[in-house]
C-alpha cells in the first residue's frame, strides 16, 4: 500500500475480556467522509472486511464478528461486544472519499487470572538431596495475557540460583483463549526451612494498571536426620500419687524416629521397656510411687537403623504412705493416760496433725498426741493427718477409735412419751460403753439391736400400749461387764388439751389414729424433755 511505511503507530485501546471495546475511527474530515467507511480486522497481515458504513448506516459482514458489532457516536465509533482474547489484533477504518485513508487501532485484551492455587509437595523434601527438589506448584488459571509469577520464601522473592533454586514455568491455552500458568518451584532446602512459609504471586495487567494476586502460604515437609532425642513430662512441677502423668519422647528430626521409653529397674539396673499408647506416650494414671525412677528414650531411625538415646530423666512421684497409728485400737481405764503416735513415709517432709473426729478440732500439730486423765468423754475418734505442705492435696489420714472402759452410759435417763391406748409403740434406747453394752427391756415386745459403732448400741422395741404399761412405764437396761444403767420411758396418754402446737412438755407424739393395734412410731417425732439429761 503506497505510503504504508510512514504510517503512525496505531491507537491503543485496552479492554477486559467480556466487556465492550469502543473502536473510534480517528480519520479527520479532511481524510475522509465518516459516512462512508469500511472496517477491517488485521490478523497475521491479512485484512478482513468486517463492517461497512454507508450514509451513516452500518452493516456487518458475515463472519466471526457478525453478531457483535454495532455503530455508535453517529457512526464514528464501532462497538465490539463480548470481547475475547482472540480479539486482540489491529482494527482499521478506511475512508473512501475524497481519497482512500485509513486509521489503525490496536486492541489489547486483558483478563485477571483466578486466585493462584498452590500445592505443596506432599512427599516432602530431604535436606541432603543432591539437586533442587520440587517444593510446590503454583497454578494461575484463565488469565490473559500470561501473568508473571514470583515465588516468595518468608516474604522474600526467590531468584533463580544455580543448583539451589530453579523455577520452571509453563502455560497452556484454554479453548477460551485464556492462559493457565503452571509454575514449579524447585529448591534445595535446609533444616531451618522446616518452618519456612512459601507462596506464589501472580502479576498481571488490566486496563486500570498493574495488579497482583497472592496464594496462601504453605510449609513444606522437610526431612532431616535426628540429632537429639529427649523426654518431656507433663504436668511440669511436683508430681503426686493419683496424678495423670504423661511421658513422651521428642526428637529434632523429621520424620521422628521410632520411639521406645524404658525405665531402669532399681534392683537389676537394667532398662526395661514400658508400654506406651498408640501415640508413643507413656501414660501413668493414676501415678504411683513405684512409677518413680530413671526413664530414658530411644529413637531408632528405621531408614538408617541409627539409634539415639536421650539423657535419662529422673521422675519423682511424691507420695504419702498409709498412715499408721499406734496403738491401733487403744483401750484405757478412766483417769489413765494415752499416747497416740502417728507414722507415715513420704518422699518429702511431712507435717502431722491430730484432729478430734467428731468436731474437727485440731488437737496437736505433730505426730504424737498425748491424752492425760482420760474421761469417758474422751472416747471416740481421733484422726491423724499426714500431709506434704509443699504439695497441696498430697495427704493421707488414719482414724483411731479410743475406747474408755466404763459401764454403759445412757443417751437419756428419763423421757416422756405421749401415747394412745392400744397403739403399737416403737421405743428406742441408746447406750455406749466399753466393752460395748447389750440392752434389755423390762417388758415383752419385739426388740432389735443395732450397733452404731464399736462402743455404742441402739435397741428398738415394738410394744402394745396397755393400761399396765401406762402404769409402770418402760425401762431399758444396758449392761456390760463393768456395770449396768437404766433409762426410763414414762408413757402418758394423749388428750386434746395437751396438743398445743409448741408445748414444751410433749416429747413425742404418734400421729396415728388410736384404733386398736394401730402401728405407730413414737420416736420419729420425739423431743427430749427440757430437764438436763443424765449421763448415768
Amino acid at each position: 500500500v503506497p505510503g504504508e511505511a510512514e504510517q503512525p503507530a496505531p491507537e491503543l485501546v485496552e479492554v477486559e475480556v467480556g466487556s465492550t471495546a469502543l473502536l473510534k475511527c480517528g480519520l479527520s474530515q479532511s481524510q475522509g467522509n465518516l459516512s462512508h467507511v469500511d472496517w477491517f480486522s488485521v490478523h497475521k497481515e491479512k485484512r478482513t472486511l468486517i463492517f461497512r458504513v454507508r450514509q451513516g448506516q452500518g452493516q456487518s459482514e458475515p463472519g466471526e464478528y457478525e453478531q457483535r458489532l454495532s455503530l455508535q457516536d453517529r457512526g464514528a465509533t464501532l462497538a465490539l461486544t463480548q470481547v475475547t482474547p482472540q480479539d486482540e489484533r489491529i482494527f482499521l477504518c478506511q475512508g473512501k472519499r475524497p481519497r482512500s485513508q485509513e486509521y489503525r487501532i490496536q486492541l489489547r485484551v486483558y483478563k485477571a487470572p483466578e486466585e493462584p492455587n498452590i500445592q505443596v509437595n506432599p512427599l516432602g523434601i530431604p535436606v541432603n538431596s543432591k539437586e533442587p527438589e520440587e517444593v510446590a506448584t503454583c497454578v494461575g488459571r484463565n488469565g490473559y495475557p500470561i501473568p508473571q509469577v514470583i515465588w516468595y520464601k518468608n516474604g522474600r522473592p526467590l531468584k533463580e540460583e544455580k543448583n539451589r533454586v530453579h523455577i520452571q514455568s509453563s502455560q497452556t491455552v484454554e479453548s477460551s483463549g485464556l492462559y493457565t500458568l503452571q509454575s514449579i518451584l524447585k529448591a534445595q532446602l535446609v533444616k531451618e526451612d522446616k518452618d519456612a512459609q512459601f507462596y506464589c504471586e501472580l502479576n498481571y495487567r488490566l486496563p486500570s494498571g498493574n495488579h497482583m494476586k497472592e496464594s496462601r502460604e504453605v510449609t513444606v515437609p522437610v526431612f532431616y536426620p535426628t540429632e537429639k532425642v529427649w523426654l518431656e513430662v507433663e504436668p511440669v512441677g511436683m508430681l503426686k500419687e493419683g496424678d495423670r502423668v504423661e511421658i513422651r519422647c521428642l526428637a529434632d528430626g523429621n520424620p521422628p524416629p521410632h520411639f521406645s521409653i524404658s525405665k531402669q529397674n532399681p534392683s537389676t539396673r537394667e532398662a526395661e521397656e514400658e508400654t506406651t499408647n498408640d501415640n508413643g506416650v507413656l501414660v501413668l494414671e493414676p501415678a504411683r510411687k513405684e512409677h518413680s525412677g530413671r526413664y530414658e528414650c530411644q529413637g531408632l531411625d528405621l531408614d538408617t537403623m541409627i539409634s539415639l538415646l536421650s539423657e535419662p530423666q529422673e521422675l519423682l512421684v511424691n507420695y504419702v504412705s498409709d498412715v499408721r497409728v499406734s496403738p491401733a485400737a487403744p483401750e484405757r481405764q478412766e483417769g489413765s493416760s494415752l499416747t497416740l503416735t502417728c507414722e507415715a513415709e513420704s518422699s518429702q517432709d511431712l507435717e502431722f496433725q491430730w484432729l478430734r473426729e467428731e468436731t474437727g478440732q485440731v488437737l496437736e500439730r505433730g505426730p504424737v498426741l498425748q491424752l492425760h486423765d482420760l474421761k469417758r468423754e474422751a472416747g471416740g475418734g481421733y484422726r491423724c493427718v499426714a500431709s506434704v505442705p509443699s504439695i497441696p492435696g498430697l495427704n493421707r489420714t488414719q482414724l483411731v477409735n479410743v475406747a474408755i472402759f466404763g459401764p454403759p452410759w445412757m443417751a437419756f435417763k428419763e423421757r416422756k412419751v405421749w401415747v394412745k391406748e392400744n397403739m403399737v409403740l416403737n421405743l428406742s434406747c441408746e447406750a455406749s460403753g466399753h466393752p460395748r453394752p447389750t440392752i434389755s427391756w423390762n417388758v415383752n415386745g419385739t426388740a432389735s439391736e443395732q450397733d452404731q459403732d464399736p462402743q455404742r448400741v441402739l435397741s428398738t422395741l415394738n410394744v402394745l400400749v396397755t393400761p399396765e404399761l401406762l402404769e409402770t412405764g418402760v425401762e431399758c437396761t444396758a449392761s456390760n461387764d463393768l456395770g449396768k444403767n437404766t433409762s426410763i420411758l414414762f408413757l402418758e396418754l394423749v388428750n386434746l388439751t395437751t396438743l398445743t402446737p409448741d408445748s414444751n412438755t410433749t416429747t413425742g407424739l404418734s400421729t396415728s389414729t388410736a384404733s386398736p393395734h394401730t402401728r405407730a412410731n413414737s420416736t420419729s417425732t420425739e423431743r427430749k424433755l427440757p430437764e438436763p439429761e443424765s449421763r448415768g
Epitope: 485400737a329 472402759f405 464399736p454 461387764d481
Partner: antibody, heavy 118, light 111 residues
Framework: QVQLVESGGGVVQPGRSLRLSCAAS????????IHWVRQAPGKGLEWVAR????????YYNEKFKGRFTISRDKSKNTLYLQMNSLRAEDTAVYYC???????????WGAGTMVTVSS | DIVMTQSPSSLSASVGDRVTITCRAS??????????MHWYQQKPGKAPKLLIY???NLESGVPSRFSGSGSGTDFTLTISSLQPEDFATYYC?????????FGQGTKLEIK
Amino acid sequence: QVQLVESGGGVVQPGRSLRLSCAASGFTFSNYWIHWVRQAPGKGLEWVARIYPGTDITYYNEKFKGRFTISRDKSKNTLYLQMNSLRAEDTAVYYCARSGGYWYFDVWGAGTMVTVSS
Amino acid sequence: DIVMTQSPSSLSASVGDRVTITCRASKSVSISGYSYMHWYQQKPGKAPKLLIYLASNLESGVPSRFSGSGSGTDFTLTISSLQPEDFATYYCQHSRELPYTFGQGTKLEIK
C-alpha cells in the same frame, strides 16, 4: 513382764473333778478379761469361758455351762477353772489368755495338760 | 454360733514365697468400721501367739511381713515373704459375739 502361768493339770478319771489355776503377773489383773481356751490333741482351739476380775462377771460357752465354773481370787491375782464330771473328750491342753474389750487374746499362758482317762 | 472356715487346711510353700490364708465367717463380724477378726500363729507344743487384731492391725513385735485384710465375712492373712520361722499353724478367731470361735487352722509346711 506380763505373764500368765497355768497349773493344776494332770490325769483324772472320767466323772471326777479338777481345778486349774492361772496366776497373773506384770499387769493390773482387774483391768483385763481372763479367758480359758482349750485345745484337744491334734485339734483346733476352743473358747471355754471368760471372767472380768474387776466385777467378777463371767460368761461361758454354752457347751460347758453347768460343768465348768470360772472364778478368781483378786488378792492372789489368780484365776480358776473348776471342771466337774469330766469326760474323755475334755482331754486337752488348757490355756488361760488375757484380753481387752475387743476380746482378742494378746497374752497366753504356756498351757496345762488335762488327760481324762480311766 | 458363728462358724469360721479357714482355707486351705494345709499348705506347702518355700522360703521367700508369698502366702495367703483365708478365713470366712458364717455371718458378718464387722461393726461400723471395726472387724472383730484376729489371727494367731501356733508352733508345736507352744501357746498361740497373736499376730493381727481387728482384721488388719499388726500386734507389737510381729514382723511387718505379716498383714491382714478383709471385712464383713471374708478375711485374709498374708505373709509377704516366708521365713523359716513362719512354718506353723495359723488360726483365725472372731469376737463379734459369744461364743468366740476359731477356724480349724491352716498348717503351713516347708515344700
